[in-house]
Interface confidence: low
Amino acid sequence: QPRSPKSKRKGQGRPGPLAPGPHQVPLDLVSRMKPYARMEEYERNIEEMVAQLRNSSELAQRKCEVNLQLWMSNKRSLSPWGYSINHDPSRIPVDLPEARCLCLGCVNPFTMQEDRSMVSVPVFSQVPVRRRLCPPPPRTGPCRQRAVMETIAVGCTCIF
């Protein structure tokens, strides 16, 4: 029963940023990156972040504005960013938080208004993920996992 192979993204997926450890303020990603002793711990923390993201309208905000009242660095930045969930069924974890710039320009620190003479750009980092690689039909053999590094947006910065 051969069928056409499924289209798969190989290494260009853009998973979300590294997760915070226990007892740390979640999703304050720029200041909270840390190494993980075990892949399981890393993946579990990613899952927790995704759950928070699903439950938080604040984190998924799409407005270009700075909010100095919030503790989250992503909303206090002059190039603020929010998070979306990057879903890829062939990847483990399947869901990853991904930074998304909220402004085309940057926020002018004096006027607190968007200034289009500057540009907000994503900052990328590499994170470890596992990919399920399945032979196309006819599948003579099982799917396999491969550990790969994928480039992801972890935040945004302002450039001239």
Epitope: P89, S90, R132, P137, R139, G141, C143
Partner: antibody, heavy 118, light 106 residues
Framework: QVTLKESGPGILQPSQTLSLTCSFS??????????VGWIRQPSGKGLEWLAH???????YYNPALKSRLTISKDTSKNQVFLKIANVDTADTATYYC??????????WGQGTSVTVSS | QIVLTQSPAIMSASPGEKVTMTCSAS?????MYWYQQKPGSSPRLLIY???NLASGVPVRFSGSGSGTSYSLTISRMEAEDAATYYC?????????FGSGTKLEIK
């Protein structure tokens, strides 16, 4: 915790259709790369792979039995089904279902015994 | 289909003895898998991808081989290792199992 459990009629007569159900928990058959297969073992004999179904509904059958086999799944109920048409005494065996992913059959059900007798 | 021939069909070993059983494939296969089955129980995965130990399997078990010739070794036989061992290939349909090697304790 991953578990699989097979169920079947126990006894049936030659020429009837054998219907087997594999009920599982701890994983989803909608997960990319996941599969569930059926293997049987006549008493005191070796293992024989029968059929397999993948997460995307891709199906494979043992060519020696293909004309008599039908595998299907109900992803929402976490179940996989196998039908064997026109059974005879040679189909008497213990039938196992097992999860296949990432290269091996790691999780197996406890098996269900099927006897074909007139 | 690829036929897997296991030898010996039956063997016995004393506790502490080294045990080696083989699996010969009628055509070249990429990897071999080994399962242990005790009477009244389901098969249990021991070795995957020829030489990798499955989770929870004692380190006295090891696998090796390539092409058409593969083997499973128990470095020091223990009473609980008495069982039937099956090799299996995934390299081409239909997936096939060997006829088994029954290992008894002396």
């Amino acid at each position: 915790q991953v578990t699989l459990k097979e169920s079947g009629p126990g006894i049936l007569q030659p020429s009837q259709t054998l219907s087997l159900t594999c009920s599982f928990s701890g994983f989803s058959l909608s997960t990319f790369g996941m599969g569930v297969g059926w293997i049987r073992q006549p008493s005191g004999k070796g293992l024989e792979w029968l059929a397999h179904i993948w997460w995307d509904d891709d199906k494979y059958y043992n060519p020696a039995l293909k004309s008599r086999l039908t595998i299907s799944k109900d992803t929402s109920k976490n179940q996989v089904f196998l039908k064997i048409a026109n059974v005879d005494t040679a189909d008497t065996a213990t039938y196992y279902c097992a999860r296949m992913n990432d290269g091996y059959l790691y999780y197996w059900g406890q098996g269900t015994s099927v006897t074909v007798s007139s | 289909q690829i036929v897997l021939t296991q030898s010996p069909a039956i063997m016995s070993a004393s506790p502490g003895e080294k045990v080696t059983m083989t699996c010969s494939a009628s055509s070249s296969v990429s990897y071999m898998y080994w399962y242990q089955q005790k009477p009244g129980s389901s098969p249990r995965l021991l070795i995957y991808d020829t030489s990798n130990l499955a989770s929870g399997v004692p380190v006295r078990f090891s696998g090796s081989g390539s092409g058409t010739s593969y083997s499973l070794t128990i470095s020091r036989m223990e009473a609980e290792d008495a069982a039937t061992y099956y090799c299996q290939q995934w390299s081409s349909y239909p997936f096939t199992f060997g006829s088994g090697t029954k290992l008894e304790i002396k």
